[in-house]
Structure formats: structure tokens, C-alpha cells
Interface confidence: low
């Protein structure tokens, strides 16, 4: 009499999450008599999947008859599949007995289920660096299987290599997560620069998902400062000018000193911005020279995104201007500043 | 006004080597990726060479390894050391400017003459 | 490296003409796209970037569109100086790379 053999034809079978799984198997006679039960996992931990002779299985069901007596076939379709079904299945011909006496199993077909990876999340630093600096970006993507997975960062389309990546968990699991953190180098230039982390994987059928992060919410962009003075006016008035020039954020305060008092405070607000992401602004100064005995000295303060400000001075030359007698009587008279300096921004 | 000059090219025996350079007035050279680009006798454009604002430098394959972009930012100025000169690569080759945040190819050079032959 | 595949390879047309350059790359570059103008013994002169963007001082004639992996150069009306050689060019990753260019003649 030939050996029963029960067939599980494939060794493994991967199905997308969501969709149906068909585990094959087949017995070389049907006697003797007795059921095909479906397990997950061996030994005496092992999982009833599918019993064709009894039992209620709402997502399973028979691919063939099994109640025709000529039917070999003991196939069975899984509906529904989540990353829970993963493991490998036995089909296991049982004798007739009480109990039914296990006769064969199948070698086993393991079910590996495809999960797309979640959307990857990047996460930048929580405080701005600037230039020069290294800062981090963190990138997460949950939920995906198998394990394998590939993830790259790019920086304006360049590929970067300082990154470090992990796949948790590290042994066998229904679902996997990625967690890389990547370290980018800042250039004055990156206001308008994006890092991209990319992952692919199986299930994407090779178009990657991308998770954006940009760069202007990490950088910041300290100010230049030059001040200037204009040539005189012929009412002795020196028009005075701070230029604070390619900074970013936005985010700025400018104070005029005179002689170390504060003669005027300003925010920046609603300034055009330049081609590479900065901004540029312009303070001035009128200073009636002839309404003081002395040279005087003006510093240009900026403080710049809650950093320690910045000085930049310059000393009006009241010596270097022929004094007109009573010609501050209009200026001051004007109400608008007691000091006789008078200023714009722009 | 913002200018390329390229200087060094002339006529060099395959093996040899050759040093050319792209002089920047205008604009800080520093604050940009500069480009080598070349064209040989009757043919199309081809990249050759970038150096980034951070020092990062790239290649096409075939140059790789045989040269090597720098900058002097206290010249202004942008050089392509190229050894093991090849027949192949007699070309003009361009100092090209990229663009400020796109890196978009925005200046040219006029161009200097490479002539590799024997 | 990502290919660059420009078409015609030549083009004759007569002042007035309305012509368009197409090129296509062999991967999606975004609109990383660029295209440049060179006459003999000249310098290439860049007209336009980001696949539509003109180059400062480039007459509004020239227009560029397309994303993705196909781009068109089309010069609106032209005039005797607009015949030359065209190139396009990715610059998405680098290696970049350029069209094997188009030439312009008079029919």
C-alpha cells in the first residue's frame, strides 16, 4: 500500500495586506479516512486555522468541495489578510479515531503578509542652528512587513550618507517600524532646501513613499551689519543707515542708540524675500548735526530670532560739519524726536 | 558686472597634466556650486566636474579619480587639476556659475581649449 | 545616471516660424529642467530654468514647460539671432547631464 502523502506544494506565499490568501494543499489518497485540519505553527501551541469537518472559520474557506468524496484537493482561502495572519500553516491529515489520531502533516507553506509602511514622518531639531552646524532629522515610518526596507535621505536631490537607521523589532514579528536619524551639515544657502527621506519597499511596487522635511524650520541665518552715512544734506542733516542683510527667520528687532541711549526700537514685518530664502532690511537715521556740541556716537542693535544682540557703531563727526546758528530751531520744533535725530525703515 | 574667466587650457601630450582656472569677479565665488563643463570639437555638452559652498566636490564617471576641482575664495577664483590627460578629453571647457538656490546653471565662462594629442 | 533624450536633433524653420524642442528624461527630474542657447564658437547662453523660469534678460519669446520627465522649448517668433544650437539638461542628481542638442537653421 503506497504511503499517504499530504502536498503543500508551496514553501511560502506573500499576500498584501487586505487582500486573500490561498494556502494549497493536496493528499495522495483518501484513505484512510479522516479529516484535513489547518494549523498555524507546530507543536502543542500550534493554532486550529480550518477544520473541514466541523467548526465555525468566517474567513476561511474551502478553494474545492470538500464534502465530494473524490475531492483530494483540501486547499483553503483566507479573506482579509492583516500582518496577525504572518506564520506557517500545516496541513495535517487526521485518522478517523476518538480522538482522531494525527497522521501526516504537510511540510508547511509560511504566509509572509506585505504591509506598506506607513507615511514617513520627518522631525527636525526643536531649536534653529546655523551654518556650519550639524543638526538632526529624525524619520519614522510604522506598521510595514516583511522586514526588509530600504531608507535613504536626500538633501535637494543629493543623496546623503550620514545616517544611522534602525528596524525595530529585531526578531520575527507580525509588523515592523524604521526609525533613521540623519545628520546634515547647514549652509547659508539651505533656507530653501528640503531633506527627503525615502523608503522603499516591497509593497510599493518601486515608487517610494516620501516624507519632506525643510530645512528653513531648522537654519538660522544670522544678519550682517553694516552702517553707513550718507552725504550731508544741505539742511546739516547726515542721513544715518543700518543695513541688516541676508537673515532668516524674519523674526527681528532693531534699536538706534545714541550716545547708549535708545533713541528708536523696530520690528521687522512683511519683508520681500531674497532669491535664496534671507530677507534684507534697511533702518535710517536723519541726525541734525548742528544741534550737537559733540561727536555722536550711533550703534545699529540688532537682536535676531532671540539671540544676544548684535552691535554695529559709527560716530556722527559733529566737528567735521559748520554749525548754522539756530538751524535745530525747526527740528526741534517739529516734536517728533527731543535728540534731533529723525528715522525711517525700509 | 558678474564674469567668468577660464585660463590654463592649451596643448598637453596624453598622460600629462594641466591645471585650469576660472577667475570670479562680481559675486563671492564661495557663496555658490561652480561647475566645469565641457564640449568637445563638433560635439554636445557634457558635465564634468562641481565643487558645493561646503567643499563637497562631484564628478562624472570618467574624470573621476584623474581630477580634481578646488576653490580659492581669497582669489575668487575656481581651478580644475586634471591628470592623466586622455585623447578623449580635448574639449572646451566652461566655468559655469550655479544658481543661487536651485543650483541652476545661470553664468558661463568663454571657455578655454584643452588639447590633448601627442 | 539619468538620460536625456532631445528631439529633432535638427530643425529647419523660417523667420516668423513658430518652433518647439522636446525633451525627455529617462527618470522623473521634477522640473529640474534647464535649457541653453549656443551659437558657434560661443559660449552656451542660459535661457531657462526650474522647466519654465527665464533667465534674466532672455526675451519673453522663449517659453519652457513640462514636469515629471517630459520638457518643451518653444520659441514664439523667430527672428535671424535665434538660430543656434539648444540644449536641454537635468539637474535634479547629480551626474548632470544634457541633451545631445538640437540645431536650429534656417529653412
Known amino acids: 500500500e503506497e504511503e499517504l502523502q499530504v502536498i503543500q506544494p508551496e514553501k511560502s506565499v506573500s499576500v498584501a495586506a487586505g487582500d486573500s490568501a490561498t494556502l494549497n494543499c493536496t493528499v495522495s489518497s483518501l484513505i484512510p479516512v479522516g479529516p484535513i485540519q489547518w494549523f498555524r505553527g507546530a507543536g502543542p501551541g500550534r493554532e486550529l486555522i480550518y477544520n473541514l469537518k466541523e467548526g465555525h472559520f468566517p474567513r476561511v474557506t474551502p478553494v474545492s468541495d470538500p464534502t465530494k468524496r473524490n475531492n483530494m484537493d483540501f486547499s483553503i482561502r483566507i479573506s482579509n489578510i492583516t500582518p496577525a495572519d504572518a506564520g506557517t500553516y500545516y496541513c495535517v491529515k487526521f485518522r478517523k479515531g476518538s480522538p482522531d489520531v494525527e497522521l501526516k502533516s504537510g511540510a508547511g507553506t509560511e504566509l509572509s503578509v506585505r504591509a506598506k509602511p506607513s507615511a514617513p514622518v520627518v522631525s527636525g531639531p526643536a531649536v534653529r542652528a546655523t551654518a556650519e552646524h550639524t543638526v538632526s532629522f529624525t524619520c519614522e515610518s510604522h506598521g510595514f512587513s516583511p522586514r526588509d526596507i530600504t531608507l535613504k535621505w536626500f538633501k535637494n536631490g543629493n543623496e546623503l550618507s550620514d545616517f544611522q537607521t534602525n528596524v525595530d523589532p529585531a526578531g520575527k514579528s507580525v509588523s515592523y517600524s524604521i526609525r533613521s536619524t540623519a545628520r546634515v551639515v547647514l549652509t547659508r544657502r539651505d533656507v530653501h532646501s528640503q531633506v527627503i527621506c525615502e523608503v522603499a519597499h516591497v509593497t510599493l511596487q518601486g515608487d517610494p513613499l516620501r516624507g519632506t522635511a525643510n530645512l528653513s524650520e531648522a537654519i538660522r541665518v544670522p544678519p550682517f551689519l553694516e552702517v553707513t552715512q550718507q552725504s550731508m544734506r544741505a539742511d546739516n542733516q547726515v542721513n544715518v543707515t543700518c543695513q541688516v542683510t541676508k537673515f532668516y527667520p524674519q523674526r527681528l528687532q532693531l534699536t538706534w542708540l545714541e550716545n547708549g541711549n535708545v533713541s528708536r526700537t523696530e520690528m521687522a514685518s512683511a519683508l520681500p524675500e531674497n532669491k535664496d530664502g534671507t530677507y534684507n532690511w534697511t533702518s535710517w537715521l536723519l541726525v541734525n548735526v548742528s544741534a550737537h556740541r559733540d561727536d555722536v556716537k550711533l550703534t545699529c542693535q540688532v537682536e535676531h530670532d532671540g539671540q544676544p544682540a548684535v552691535n554695529k557703531s559709527f560716530s556722527v563727526k559733529v566737528s567735521a560739519h559748520p554749525k548754522e546758528q539756530g538751524s535745530n530751531t525747526a527740528a526741534e520744533n517739529t516734536g517728533t524726536n527731543e535728540r534731533n535725530i529723525y528715522g525711517g525703515s525700509g | 558686472e558678474v564674469q567668468l574667466v577660464e585660463s590654463g587650457g592649451g596643448l598637453v601630450q596624453p598622460g600629462g597634466s594641466l591645471r585650469l582656472s576660472c577667475a570670479a569677479s562680481?559675486?563671492?565665488?564661495?557663496?555658490?556650486?561652480m561647475h566645469w563643463v565641457r564640449q568637445a570639437p563638433g560635439k554636445g555638452l557634457e558635465w564634468v566636474s562641481a565643487?558645493?559652498?561646503?567643499?563637497?566636490?562631484y564628478y562624472t564617471g570618467s574624470v573621476k579619480g584623474r581630477f580634481t576641482i578646488s576653490r580659492e575664495n581669497a582669489k575668487n577664483s575656481l581651478y580644475l587639476q586634471m591628470n592623466s590627460l586622455r585623447a578623449e578629453d580635448t574639449a572646451v571647457y566652461y566655468c559655469?556659475?550655479?544658481?543661487?538656490?536651485?543650483?541652476?546653471?545661470?553664468?558661463w565662462g568663454q571657455g578655454t581649449m584643452v588639447t590633448v594629442s601627442s | 545616471d539619468i538620460q536625456m533624450t532631445q528631439s529633432p536633433s535638427s530643425l529647419s524653420a523660417s523667420v516668423g516660424d513658430r518652433v518647439t524642442i522636446t525633451c525627455r528624461a529617462s527618470?522623473?527630474?521634477?522640473?529640474?529642467a534647464a535649457w541653453f542657447q549656443q551659437k558657434p564658437g560661443k559660449a552656451p547662453k542660459s535661457l531657462i530654468y526650474?522647466?519654465?523660469s527665464l533667465h534674466s534678460g532672455v526675451p519673453s519669446k522663449f517659453s519652457g514647460s513640462g514636469s515629471g520627465t517630459d520638457f518643451t522649448l518653444t520659441i514664439s517668433s523667430l527672428q535671424p539671432e535665434d538660430f543656434a544650437t539648444y540644449y536641454c539638461?537635468?539637474?535634479?542628481?547629480?551626474?548632470?547631464?544634457f541633451g545631445q542638442g538640437t540645431k536650429l537653421e534656417i529653412k
Open positions: 539638461q537635468q539637474y535634479v542628481s547629480y551626474p548632470y547631464t
Open positions: 559655469v556659475r550655479g544658481g543661487v538656490w536651485d543650483d541652476a546653471f545661470d553664468i
Open positions: 565643487i558645493g559652498t561646503a567643499g563637497d566636490t
Open positions: 527618470q522623473g527630474i521634477n522640473n529640474y
Open positions: 526650474t522647466a519654465s
Open positions: 562680481g559675486f563671492t565665488l564661495s557663496s555658490y556650486d
